[in-house]
Structure formats: C-alpha cells, structure tokens
C-alpha cells in the first residue's frame, strides 16, 4: 500500500532510502523546457517477484517547444558524468539492491529528467537520515524511519537524529566518514531534498555500498 | 493529506462559457499533472485532458478540444478548466484528479439550461 | 482511442461473498490500469494502480490482477460498504479511457 505522507522533515537533513520496495512510484518528471511525452508513460514502477525486482515503464521526455518529438531514455555521456549511478561509481561493484528480496535499486537516470526525483513509497519502506554538509548528529536512536500501517492508516516513524550547526558532517548508520563528491557539489540544507553527492552507506543488508544521491523530493 | 477543492455548482444558458476551478492543497501543485474528468449519466467517465502547473503544458482529448481549456496558477495552487458554446451536452458532473498518485475532488455540477 | 469493456453493467453478491469484475482493453496496455469505487453522490475513489498495487486505506480484501488486455478486480469477503460501482481506466496512452463501470448490488 502506498504511503500517504512524506517521511518526516529534520531541519537541516535530507533522507534517502537505499532500495525501494515493490510498488514504489517514480513519478516521470522532466527538466525545465522539456515535457513527459503525451502517451509516455506517467511513472516508473518497482516491481517483480520474490526472486527479482525491477524498474517497469520508461520515462521519456520531450522538448516543449518540439510537437511529436521523443528524446531517448538512454542518458548522454555529459548527463552521465553529472548523475553518477551506483554502476558508475567505482572499480568495485556495490551489492545489488535488488539482491534484497522484493526491493528495487535506483533507477537510472533518463534523458532531460527533472532535478528532483518524486517517489511514492510504500509500507515497510525505510529511509536513512544524515545531516546536510556543516551540521553535526546528535543521535538518539536510529537516524531512520520506517513507513508503517496503523489501524488502516499509514505513517512513518520519527527519526532520532538532531542535527546541530557545528562545521562538520554527519554519516548514515554505518559510515566511518563521508567521502567527498568528486564534483564538490554542496549538499542542499532543504530538508525534503537529499542532493547529488557520495558516500558510503550501511543497507539493511549490512552491506557497504557507495552510491550517488540524486536531487530527491519525495511528496 | 492531498487535497482537491472545486468550486460550486453552476447554472448557466447555452451559448454561454464557464470556468472550473480546482484548489490543490498538500502537496507540491508544479510538480503534478492534474487532469479533468466528465461524468454524465449514461455515458461513463470521459477523460478531457490535464495540465502540468510547473511548465503550462497541456495535454487534450481530440474530443474536447475547442471545447475546453485548461489553466493553472501556481501562486494559488488553483487549476482551471474553461468551458465555452455550451449546449445541454455539457450538463454533466466535473472533477478535476490529480492524475498519479490519483486523488480526485468532490465534483462540480454543470447544468445547461435556458 | 482505447475502449475499456466492463461487460458486465451489474453484479448482484451477498455480504461475504466473493466477487470479481472484469475489464478487457482493446489493445494491450501492459500494466497501466487503475480501478476506482464510486458511491451515488460522490467523487471516485482510487483502489488499485498499475493494475494490482493497492492505495493506502484501501482493505486488502480488494485485489486487483491482471495485464496486457485483461484485468479482474476482486472482492473477497463483500461488505455492505462494498456496494458501489467500479470503473477501470487505462492509462497507458492518450486519451485516457475509462471501463463503462460495474454496479456491484445485494442479492
């Protein structure tokens, strides 16, 4: 079942979830100037079977000021050099998220995508905390929260993690400290965004993993 | 909790032209596309068309174009729906739905009548 | 345009019971299916996406299946709250269509 509401804002931090769970939506979203095709499809889909999940749909978009014209999903070198995916982002592979049963990794990015990625999570779905760059945790439990549903309605748990103005940056569960990103993009301090940087992460897998976080807003 | 408040009933002579409007609240109103929706009795669920607010992009059932147009403004969160040269063929119930994840408002009632 | 057929207008069920409506798309749409349940007076409310996923709030008695052209709501354990009519749409490509509807009444 889909979650009704945004996981919970900290002020200055951003969330990820480092698999989606079947059913997640992605909503097809493109750039300033560019437009979802009229019958493209309107999100992605996480979905599958025990044994394997993946991506349904492709978004595709087109320029707006171009009629009947589609762009291919397949991203361009410059656009792959700014998203990074998790495939492209060191000699050693990550574990495949999708290795966790009925989970989906992070798709990968498709040409003239919009900024921010809109997910519709579903029940059971996890999000990690960290604060953004020149806030310090301050830990009081998990830095995590878990979309849940109670007596037919759905809401996400309240992360313990405060996040305090000290000139230094936090890690997700696991991180011994955060690498920089290769471009030194700034972290954004808009706390439903989580932006483009890298870092070692923990999954529920207790596997480490680098991956690259894509501007988010989830709604 | 998403949220889509339309306007009131309305009664109006044929030949004559109408505007819908639609109230987003509870989520991000740019950052979805919001569709329009005829229910007449008899006749099902017709689809007329939708907008995305962000970028005043348009998409239109080949049925209802000439017929309807859609607008948006963001500063309000407010979707319009304008309709022109009425005729008793318009008379039917209105609902503007936010297209996915979908959430539809309660529904404007449209009488043509002289 | 493509035309969703909800053969049948009505179905008539008991509380308890377990129902299936049908909905068959004139040409395949893979997985891009809803269904909605409206009640007399009322806007439709969305139960089912990408033809088996199911909306927050909606009880899991409600399952939805199917892909290509055919799809099947399904209503286990009917209660009277159930009785509505369903409607399937597409929404693989535009124009958006929807199924003519499924009035669902007690036997």
């Known amino acids: 079942e889909l979650c009704d509401d945004d996981p919970p804002e900290i002020p200055h931090a951003t969330f990820k979830a480092m698999a989606y769970k079947e059913g997640t939506m992605l909503n097809c979203e493109c750039k300033r100037g560019f437009r979802r095709i009229k019958s493209g499809s309107l999100y992605m889909l996480c979905t599958g079977n025990s044994s394997h999940s993946s991506w349904d749909n492709q978004c595709q978009c087109t320029s707006s000021a171009t009629r009947n014209t589609t762009k291919q999903v397949t991203p361009q070198p410059e656009e792959q050099k700014e998203r990074k995916t998790t495939e492209m982002q060191s000699p050693m592979q990550p574990v495949d998220q999708a290795s966790l049963p009925g989970h989906c990794r992070e798709p990968p990015p498709w040409e003239n995508e919009a900024t921010e990625r809109i997910y519709h999570f579903v029940v059971g779905q996890m999000v990690y905390y960290q604060c953004v760059q020149g806030y310090r945790a301050l830990h009081r439990g998990p830095a995590e929260s878990v979309c849940k549903m109670t007596h037919g309605k759905t809401r996400w748990t309240q992360p313990q993690l405060i996040c305090t103005g000290e000139m230094e940056t936090s890690q997700f569960p696991g991180e011994e400290k955060p690498q920089a990103s290769p471009e030194g993009r700034p972290e954004s301090e808009t706390s439903c965004l989580v932006t483009t940087t890298d870092f070692q992460i923990q999954t529920e897998m207790a596997a480490t993993m680098e991956t690259s976080i894509f501007t988010t807003e989830y709604q | 909790h998403v949220q889509l408040q339309q306007s009131g009933a309305e009664l109006v002579r044929p030949g004559t032209s109408v505007k819908i409007s639609c109230k987003a609240s509870?989520?991000?109103?740019?950052?979805?596309?919001l569709g329009w929706v005829k229910q007449r009795p008899g006749h099902g669920l017709e689809w007329i068309g939708d907008?995305?607010?962000?970028?005043?992009?348009?998409n239109y059932n080949e049925k209802f174009k000439g017929k309807a147009t859609l607008t948006a403004d963001t500063s309000s969160s407010t979707a319009y729906m304008q309709l022109s040269s009425l005729t008793s063929e318009d008379s039917a119930v209105y609902f503007c739905?936010?297209?996915?994840?979908?959430?539809w408002g309660q529904g404007t009632s449209l009488t043509v009548s002289s | 345009d493509i035309v969703m057929t909800q053969s049948q207008k009505f179905m008539s069920t008991s509380v308890g019971d377990r129902v299936s409506v049908t909905c068959k798309a004139s040409?395949?749409?893979?997985?891009?299916v809803a269904w909605y349940q409206q009640k007399p007076g009322q806007s439709p409310k969305a139960l089912i996406y990408?033809?088996?996923y199911r909306y927050s709030g909606v009880p899991d008695r409600f399952t939805g299946s199917g892909s290509g052209t055919d799809f099947t709501l399904t209503i286990s354990n009917v209660q009277s709250e159930d009785l509505a009519e369903y409607f399937c749409?597409?929404?693989?490509?535009?124009?958006?269509?929807f199924g003519g509807g499924t009035k669902l009444e007690m036997k």
């Open positions: 040409q395949n749409v893979g997985t891009n």
């Open positions: 509870g989520y991000t109103f740019t950052n979805y596309w």
């Open positions: 739905a936010r297209v996915t994840p979908a959430s």
């Open positions: 990408s033809a088996s």
């Open positions: 749409q597409q929404y693989n490509s535009y124009p958006y269509t």
């Open positions: 907008i995305y607010p962000g970028g005043g992009y348009t």
